[in-house]
Interface confidence: medium
């Protein structure tokens, strides 16, 4: 998360590390008690590594009662999904096991009604992503408020260039933005998932270059199939 | 501490249209939601809809699209709930409460002491 | 649209008893629930969040449990100012409906 600050510690439990050997690859959100959601291209990172999801945390590095890593039983990236592009990015893990829910572990609802979220509305994006175009990578979770950024401007040539389709969505990304590292993880507006980070090697924080975000409402019938 | 002041009782014809206000203090005004909801005499709660000031963004509960419109002064802290083409079935006490934007706190945490809307000829 | 069903309507009882009121959700709401208690021409007081966290200043003989679609609200020894009605309200996504509540009247 470029330009964003330290959140608040387990207010967002719904929020995941997809981790690859012990180690911090991409966000996911819970979705339901054995699911987590995150971007396809995420599992073409981890190569043949052993994939985990760790929920409940705040620091990736320090011991926290709520902390627990769970190993995947299942990836499911959805079939459309392509190595050389960004549409279908998505991805469900179903771990080992139903997650322990509380406080700190919670699935966030996410969005059916397959209607644009209004520009200019602030959604909360939240991550272990780069924290700084040197690559330094926090170790507590950061987020960032950003306003929606409508379709048309984020296709201009100067922008994306028709490169955004109806199932994604666009946030305004000047100075502050989502990053590497942040894949997979949640765009909430209003309390509802409405966007997943999308795992394209986008510049960020360049405002000519929005962050790009995969709609889960445009993917509830797939989403509902694979969790039924 | 954190205190939402609503205005006083309404007493409107039907047809017309009325505004109620929200005043918030004690906290940041654009980090939490306002939402508004409707409680008829002797009946139970129904939940109306939210604002983020922040933003300004809305949501409505279906219901009660078209009834209710939300809004937010910013400069002053305030909220407002503009409520038209009224009818008795409007007569009602509303309240404005507080929900947290990102905390864990997903409930209602603080709230307003309501305002009295009475419709009648 | 999530609906939940609270029971009972009505409940009368007496000083020191031990109550019970639950809330079923028509969907799994994951520990997203509320309990509320009002008092007459009073607003509604949170006294639970997030399905078994008491809020600040709550007494500990309330308590809440529950978990998917089904959730309660108990009260150990009931005191005099107890009596009101208790509303249940889940926060698993718009709207965020309330349950039809529940009457504690003194016996």
């Known amino acids: 998360i470029l330009g964003g600050r330290e959140a608040e510690a387990h207010a967002r439990p719904y929020m995941a590390s997809v981790q690859v050997n012990g180690e911090h690859l991409c966000g996911g959100v819970l979705v339901a008690e054995q699911w987590v959601l995150s971007a396809a291209h995420c599992l073409e990172d981890a190569a043949d590594g052993k994939v985990q999801v760790l929920l409940g945390a705040h620091s990736l590095s320090q011991p926290e009662p709520s902390k627990r890593l769970y190993d995947v039983l299942r990836a499911v990236p959805h079939p459309d999904s392509r190595p050389d592009t960004i549409d279908h990015d998505l991805l469900l893990l179903q771990l080992s096991e139903k997650a322990t829910l509380g406080p700190a572990v919670r699935p966030l609802p996410w969005q059916r009604v397959d209607r644009d979220v209004e520009p200019g509305t602030l959604c909360d994006v939240a991550g272990w992503g780069i924290v700084s175009h040197a690559g330094r990578r926090p170790d507590r979770l950061q987020h960032v408020l950003l306003p929606v950024l409508d379709r048309a401007t984020c296709n201009r040539r100067t922008h994306h260039d028709g490169a955004i389709t109806q199932r994604m969505m666009c946030a305004e990304s000047n100075r502050r933005d989502s990053c590497k590292g942040d894949s997979g993880g949640p765009l909430v507006c209003g309390g509802v998932l409405e966007g997943v980070v999308t795992s394209g090697s986008r510049v960020c924080g360049n405002r000519k270059k929005p962050g790009i975000y995969t709609r889960v409402a445009s993917y509830a019938a797939w989403i509902d199939s694979v969790l039924a | 501490q954190v205190q939402l002041q609503q205005s006083g009782p309404e007493l409107v014809k039907p047809g017309a249209s009325v505004k109620i206000s929200c005043k918030a203090s004690?906290?940041?005004?654009?980090?939490?939601?306002i939402n508004w909801v409707k409680q008829r005499p002797g009946q139970g709660l129904e939940w109306i809809g939210w604002i983020f000031p922040g933003s300004g963004s809305t949501y409505y509960n279906e219901k009660f699209k078209g009834k209710a419109t939300l809004t937010v002064d910013k400069s002053s802290s305030t909220a407002y709930m503009l409520l038209s083409s009224l009818t008795s079935e409007d007569s009602a006490v509303y309240f404005c409460?507080?929900?947290?934007?990102?905390?864990?706190?997903?409930?209602?945490?603080?709230w307003g002491q309501g305002t009295s809307v009475t419709v009648s000829s | 649209d999530i609906q939940m069903t609270q029971s009972p309507a009505s409940l009368s009882v007496s000083v020191g008893e031990t109550v019970t009121i639950t809330c079923r959700a028509s969907e799994n709401i994951y520990s997203n629930l509320a309990w509320y208690q009002q008092k007459q021409g009073k607003s509604p007081q949170l006294l639970v969040y997030v399905a078994t966290n008491l809020a600040d200043g709550v007494p500990s003989r309330f308590s809440g449990s529950g978990s998917g679609t089904q959730y309660s609200l108990k009260i150990n020894s009931l005191q005099s100012e107890d009596f009101g009605n208790y509303y249940c309200?889940?926060?698993?996504?718009?709207?965020?409906?309330f349950g039809g509540g529940t009457k504690l009247e003194m016996r």
């Open positions: 409460a507080r929900t947290g934007y990102y905390s864990n706190l997903y409930a209602v945490d603080y």
């Open positions: 004690g906290y940041s005004f654009t980090d939490y939601y």
């Open positions: 309200q889940h926060f698993w996504g718009t709207p965020y409906t």
